[in-house]
Interface confidence: low
């Protein structure tokens, strides 16, 4: 008799794929544009990335460091009007993209939370949550919560408002902290909070250290849902050399939790390559004309247009991973088991019941390595087969779909492999 199927877990929409942050509308759209009406024209692009949610803004009125001139209920006219926002929500809904609004109050100022007027600001946030929930947003983000006194209790209250409106609404908190204990204390009192932090940003470039960070985090957070990113707002290129971008994309999309990216991560957007551009929000490179300041500074392979036409590009990899992440049960909500694969490597299995299973092997090092996969580390429910099919490699040159012998697996420098194999009773 066939074994009973495992009951599917309740899945919220943010469990089903990546979130995409657009913190700076002007930089994202470029060409002196940068409003809500223009963003609506980019929703098809977001659809092509298969992202599930757009984390937008902040876009509210905020006069630098002035509480009285900060209105969380009003959109800064430079970004658009309430009707433009409404229109964006409508179009996004039609494309199945959820909209999360960043309500970090003093986003133009020194202290995001006006340190001297915490209660006034907290009340403003409460009112804003209720107002924007009524307007149809799918969730909220607040950043820099390490600057918010009594953050845990405020977050719990805001979470109650958000969840009280609908279980389908999401609250994201962001912190610059990379300290696990600090992160855990924020999570403790907030069951469903999604927290973005700098926890992974100092993972360096060793597989062992990354493995240790990931497993520590997952063990410490138990079976609560988490998110994966390298910071609360910044680009991957702020932390990673170009040769590790593909590896991290593969990892972020295949760890258990919600991957969170910033605009430009999908093309390896790098402020350092664009003289005069701010590190935190460089102009998005749609095509070679997106950065006219220095003619010739932008080549086609740095842009969305150029990478869209190249099946071997970072953007093409992002799209493929995003697609897999959103449709494979084992990647959507499967169990996670990390195991030893040799020095410099990080490897893990994702599996769910009798569905197709996935093996991820990541070589963080700058030399080619043979993987010594230690299957003995794995529980019986997650045993390794002798061979697995190559779904994709982060490096060109491998024949996709071909079976690879796991005992004789060799990885190129900075290569990541995503392999699939069937459930065997």
């Amino acid at each position: 008799r066939a074994p009973r199927c495992r009951e599917l877990p309740a899945q919220k929409w943010w469990h089903t794929g990546a979130l995409y942050r657009i913190g700076d509308l002007q930089a994202f759209q470029g060409h002196g544009a940068g409003n809500l009406a223009g963003l609506k024209g980019r929703l098809d692009y977001l659809s092509s990335l298969k992202v599930k949610g757009l984390v937008l803004g902040p876009i509210h009125k905020n006069q630098k460091d002035d509480v009285a001139q900060t209105d969380l209920l009003q959109i800064d006219p430079n970004f658009g009007s309430k009707e433009d926002f409404d229109s964006l929500l409508q179009s996004a809904k039609k494309k199945s993209i959820r909209v999360i609004l960043d309500l970090t109050p003093n986003y133009r100022g020194e202290n995001s939370w006006f340190s001297t007027q915490v209660d006034t600001v907290a009340t403003k946030v409460k009112d804003a949550l209720e107002f924007w929930l009524q307007a149809g947003v799918d969730g909220f983000q607040v950043r820099d919560i390490e600057n918010l006194k009594d953050a845990s209790s405020f977050l719990a209250e805001w979470q109650n408002i958000t969840k009280g409106f609908s279980e389908d609404r999401l609250l994201i908190a962001g912190t610059n902290s990379s300290d696990l204990q600090q992160i855990l204390s924020l999570l403790e009192s907030n069951k469903d909070l999604l927290l973005t932090s700098s926890y992974l940003s100092d993972s360096g470039s060793t597989g062992e250290h990354t493995k240790s960070l990931v497993t520590q985090y997952l063990n410490a957070t138990g079976n609560r849902w988490c998110s994966w990113s390298l910071s609360q707002a910044r680009l991957l290129t702020s932390f990673l050399p170009a040769q590790l971008l593909r590896l991290y994309q593969l990892m972020l999309f295949t760890l258990p939790g919600t991957p969170v990216f910033s605009y430009g991560d999908e093309i390896g957007l790098d402020a350092a390559a664009l003289p005069g551009q701010p590190m935190e929000a460089p102009v998005m490179l749609w095509d070679e004309s997106s950065f006219p300041d220095i003619p010739g500074a932008v080549s086609a392979n740095m842009t969305v247009k150029g990478q869209s036409e190249d099946p071997g590009s970072l953007l093409s990899l992002f799209r493929r991973l995003s697609d897999q992440r959103s449709k494979e049960r084992s990647l959507l909500h499967g169990d996670f088991h990390a195991f030893s694969a040799g020095p410099g490597l990080f490897s893990y299995i994702r599996h769910w019941d009798q569905n197709e299973r996935f093996l991820v092997v990541l070589n963080f090092g700058d030399v080619g390595l043979s993987a010594g996969l230690q299957a003995s580390d794995l529980p019986a429910s997650a045993s390794l087969p002798a061979k697995a099919d190559l779904l994709l490699s982060t490096q060109p040159g491998r024949e996709e779909g071909s079976p690879l012998e796991l005992e004789r697996l060799k990885l190129e420098p900075h290569e990541g492999l995503l392999l699939r194999f069937p459930y065997a009773a």
């Epitope: 009406a37 009003q74 959109i75 006219p77 430079n78 658009g80 009007s81 309430k82 009707e83 433009d84 409404d86 229109s87 929500l89 409508q90 179009s91 809904k93 009524q134 307007a135 149809g136």
Partner: antibody, heavy 120, light 106 residues
Framework: EVQLVESGGGVVRPGGSLRLSCAAS????????MTWVRQAPGKGLEWVST????????GYADSVKGRFTISRDNAKNSLYLQMNSLRAEDTALYYC?????????????WGQGTLVTVSS | EIVLTQSPATLSLSPGERATLSCRAS??????LAWYQQKPGQAPRLLIY???NRATGIPARFSGSGSGTDFTLTISSLEPEDFAVYYC????????FGQGTKVEIK
């Protein structure tokens, strides 16, 4: 042909209630935000209330907040304004207007109005 | 609440003359400003949206300009049918209308 037809106006005593309706045809109603605008006899235009395409977002002028409620039924292509605790200063011709949020334009479809008179 | 102040209250001109109507906002509305024309017994008619864009079917003699807090509606050469009341309207934060400018025959 686009049409917005208001109804439900009439004479009512101060403190009384009325419910205005606006029937829409000739355009895709649920692509449009809808608004009530009023005009007291011999006076200018005054915005009253707006509702978003899906009914999720609503806004009210300070003068009617807490007394008037805007709603819509997309299945019936209809917009409503429930007016309670009416005052003499609410006497006006009430227009319903549709603004096309798909292109981010202004209220470009207007009805001919329904007259509300609040008098003892 | 954003207050819109129109000037002048009344403008007396002859057909063929140029009309310049002004609208000032109490705070910046970016370019989220419209102009409407209203004739007695009729509903308002949209002329200009987003400060300078002519609505469908509006003659080229009507033009709008401005951004932030100061806006202008210009009718380059008045036709007999242009004598009416003109309202500006913002949609930066919900809606508000100006009090109107009446353009009458001199």
């Amino acid at each position: 042909e686009v049409q917005l037809v208001e109804s439900g106006g009439g004479v009512v005593r101060p403190g009384g209630s009325l419910r205005l309706s606006c029937a829409a045809s000739g355009f895709t109603f649920d692509d449009y935000g809808m608004t009530w605008v009023r005009q007291a006899p011999g006076k200018g235009l005054e915005w009253v209330s707006t509702i978003s395409w899906n009914g999720g977002g609503t806004g009210y002028a300070d003068s009617v907040k807490g007394r008037f409620t805007i709603s819509r039924d997309n299945a019936k292509n209809s917009l409503y304004l429930q007016m309670n605790s009416l005052r003499a200063e609410d006497t006006a011709l009430y227009y319903c207007a549709g603004y096309c949020i798909i292109t981010g334009c202004y209220a470009d479809y207007w009805g001919q109005g329904t007259l509300v008179t609040v008098s003892s | 609440e954003i207050v819109l102040t129109q000037s002048p209250a009344t403008l007396s001109l002859s057909p063929g003359e140029r009309a310049t109507l002004s609208c000032r906002a109490s705070q910046s509305v970016s370019s989220y400003l419209a102009w409407y024309q209203q004739k007695p017994g009729q509903a308002p008619r949209l002329l200009i949206y987003d400060a300078s864009n002519r609505a469908t079917g509006i003659p080229a003699r009507f033009s709008g300009s401005g951004s932030g807090t100061d806006f202008t509606l210009t009718i380059s050469s008045l036709e007999p049918e242009d004598f009416a009341v003109y309202y500006c309207q913002q949609r930066s934060n919900w809606w508000t209308f100006g009090q109107g400018t009446k353009v009458e025959i001199k």
